[in-house]
């Protein structure tokens, strides 16, 4: 290298895989400028695990590693990590070459590449790179899905990570499907979780200086098939004036395809109930859930005869659910009068209609 040259990787774009794990020989006294990522979103540079400050003789700034004049203590391993993650964009070892001023022929060039022989960088205990994300403890995941635990950390020397489940070393050997580890992403992945995966998962991050840990509490949820669930309070008791329009709403939740009916309670031979004890009803509307407007019963131009009890009945392959409400119809000449209608009934019984 000529004395006037800078060591430079161009263009300043995120490198391809082929650009990773490079060795560069740099002459003493030579300026260095290494680029990593786009200037606005360039990665962060680390030397031997310590993030470089944006100012100083050796600095990491806007995705660039800049060394004003290369010195023996600048030799070593440099990493550029993507912002917001621990993805390695650049992995470089700078080696001291021929001096532009004076050289020490007795010096072992490998000594600048072996962190164990170097004491010029400050050691640092592990720390979380995004501590604000390490707050939510309990996580509930439906069975059959995949869970990813991550504990991105840094330190000097670069920490190692290991995982515990319920306080015991966890390698997934007893788990169907095993586990997937990505140490460079500080992650543990478990595919197709089952109830036996419930527990406390601990990432233990440690180096020679210290250690930190974080607990994830995992709950695996199982779905038991159930009959339709009706939203509480719907349909709601309603008061209307003769001649007006009324809408009764019924919100249905169901895994299995539900079938919905709107029923009006009627009186037959002076009785509201049959010999079997179930009420007499008239089916006003029936449809599947994916029919439009099925969860709304429209009553147009209501009359006094429309007053009474209405029921939303929803059924699926598992069972039936229903809720009822009262419609009170007031005469036109007295709109201020309000009836004390019975409360809407929220029941869990199977419903029978004739």
């Amino acid at each position: 290298l000529e004395a006037s040259e800078e060591v430079e990787l161009e263009p300043c774009l995120a490198p391809s895989l082929e650009q990773q794990e490079q060795e560069l020989t740099v002459a003493l006294g030579q300026p260095v400028r290494l680029c990593c990522g786009r200037a606005e979103r360039g990665g962060h540079w680390y030397k031997e695990g310590s993030r470089l400050a944006p100012a100083g003789r050796v600095r990491g700034w806007r995705g660039r590693l800049e060394i004003a004049s290369f010195l023996p203590e600048d030799a070593g391993r440099y990493l550029c990590l993507a912002r917001g993650s621990m993805i390695v964009l650049q992995n470089l070892t700078l080696i001291t070459g021929d001096s532009l001023t004076s050289s020490n022929d007795d010096e072992d060039p490998k000594s600048h590449r072996d962190p164990s022989n170097r004491h010029s960088y400050p050691q640092q205990a592990p720390y979380w790179t995004h501590p604000q994300r390490m707050e939510k403890k309990l996580h509930a995941v439906p069975a059959g899905n995949t869970v990813k635990f991550r504990c991105p950390a840094a330190g000097n020397p670069t920490p190692t990570i290991r995982w515990l489940k319920d306080g015991q070393a966890f390698h997934g050997e007893n788990r169907i499907g095993g586990i997937r580890l990505r140490h460079q992403h500080w992650s543990l992945v478990m595919e197709s979780v089952v109830p036996s995966d419930r527990g406390t998962y601990t990432c233990l991050v440690e180096n020679a200086v210290g250690s930190i840990r974080y607990n994830y509490l995992l709950d695996v949820l199982e779905r038991s098939p159930h009959r339709p669930i009706l939203q509480a309070g719907l349909p709601a008791n309603t008061t209307a004036v003769v001649g007006s329009d009324v809408e009764l709403l019924c919100k249905v939740y169901s895994d299995a395809q539900p079938h919905i009916q709107w029923l009006k309670h009627i009186v037959i031979n002076g009785s509201s109930f049959g010999a079997d004890g179930f009420p007499y009803v008239q089916v006003l509307k029936t449809a599947d859930i994916n029919s439009s407007e099925v969860e709304v019963l429209y009553l147009r131009n209501v009359s006094a005869e429309d007053a009474g009890e209405y029921t939303c009945l929803a059924g699926n392959s598992i069972g039936l659910s229903y809720q009822s409400a009262w419609l009170t119809v007031l005469p036109e000449e007295d709109p201020t009068w309000t009836a004390a209608a019975p409360e809407a009934r929220y029941t869990d019984h199977h419903h029978h209609h004739h």
């Epitope: 439906p142 899905n145 990813k148 991105p152 995992l218 779905r223």
Partner: antibody
């Protein structure tokens, strides 16, 4: 063995409706989902929408929102894509795909991955 | 919507070649990226999820890497059955979006 079989495709006039079915076997819907993806002739893949069985939620691409509806009958292990107000640009092969979630607990979001796909059914919208 | 741009759009390669396809997102998608392979007249098949995790049953010659906006699918030694179109897809943003595809053809 996981299998997905689409049916219901065919020729329909602009403005018309069609309902596609996706019959699944080898797994149950209860805690995963079904996505619909389409591919116009000679073109790339376009995500249409997703049904998430755990909470019954649905999500749609803007291009079909308000016109297409995804539903499912978990007792039959079948998902449906109801397509209304069809347009010529809806012409495509429609695939259904089993969809599972990758719950990334660190960033607290779910990545949705489509791991098993049906063979596809062709929908042609033309007058 | 998050735009996914694949490059190249097509490439010619020989059996045994190392092939690299890149995918760039218009905004940060963390590691929420999957790769799919599709042969003509067939449904897509999942290869990689979460940017770098090999889906079960997929040969180990496939690998994925990247995070944020830049991702790579690598086939270390191309096999005859690998000639197909490859799609990347993100699902961190709504709606899920695919890249336009990269067609790998026989040289």
């Amino acid at each position: 063995e996981v299998q997905l079989v689409e049916s219901g495709g065919g020729l329909v006039q602009p403005g018309g409706s069609l309902r596609l079915s996706c019959a699944a076997s080898g797994f149950t819907f209860t805690s995963t989902g079904i996505s619909w993806v389409r591919q116009a002739p000679g073109k790339g893949l376009e995500w249409v929408g997703r049904y998430w069985a755990w909470d019954g939620s649905t999500n749609y691409a803007d291009s079909v929102k308000g016109r297409f509806t995804i539903s499912a009958d978990t007792s039959k292990n079948t998902a449906y894509l109801q397509m209304n107000s069809l347009r010529a640009e809806d012409t495509a092969v429609y695939y259904c795909a089993r969809t599972y979630g990758i719950y990334d607990l660190y960033v607290d979001y779910t990545e949705y991955v489509m791991d098993y796909w049906g063979q596809g059914t062709l929908v042609t919208v033309s007058s | 919507d998050i735009q996914m741009t694949q490059s190249p759009s097509s490439l010619s390669a020989s059996v045994g070649d190392r092939v690299t396809i890149t995918c760039r997102a218009s905004q940060d998608v963390d590691t929420s990226l999957a790769w799919y392979k599709q042969k003509p007249g067939k449904a897509p098949k999942l290869l990689i999820y979460s940017a770098s995790f090999l889906y079960s049953g997929v040969p180990s010659r496939f690998s994925g890497s990247g995070s944020g906006t830049d991702f790579t699918l690598t086939i270390s030694s191309l096999q005859p059955e690998d000639f197909a179109t490859y799609y990347c897809q993100q699902s961190t943003g709504h709606p899920q979006t695919f890249g336009q595809g990269t067609k790998v053809e026989i040289k």
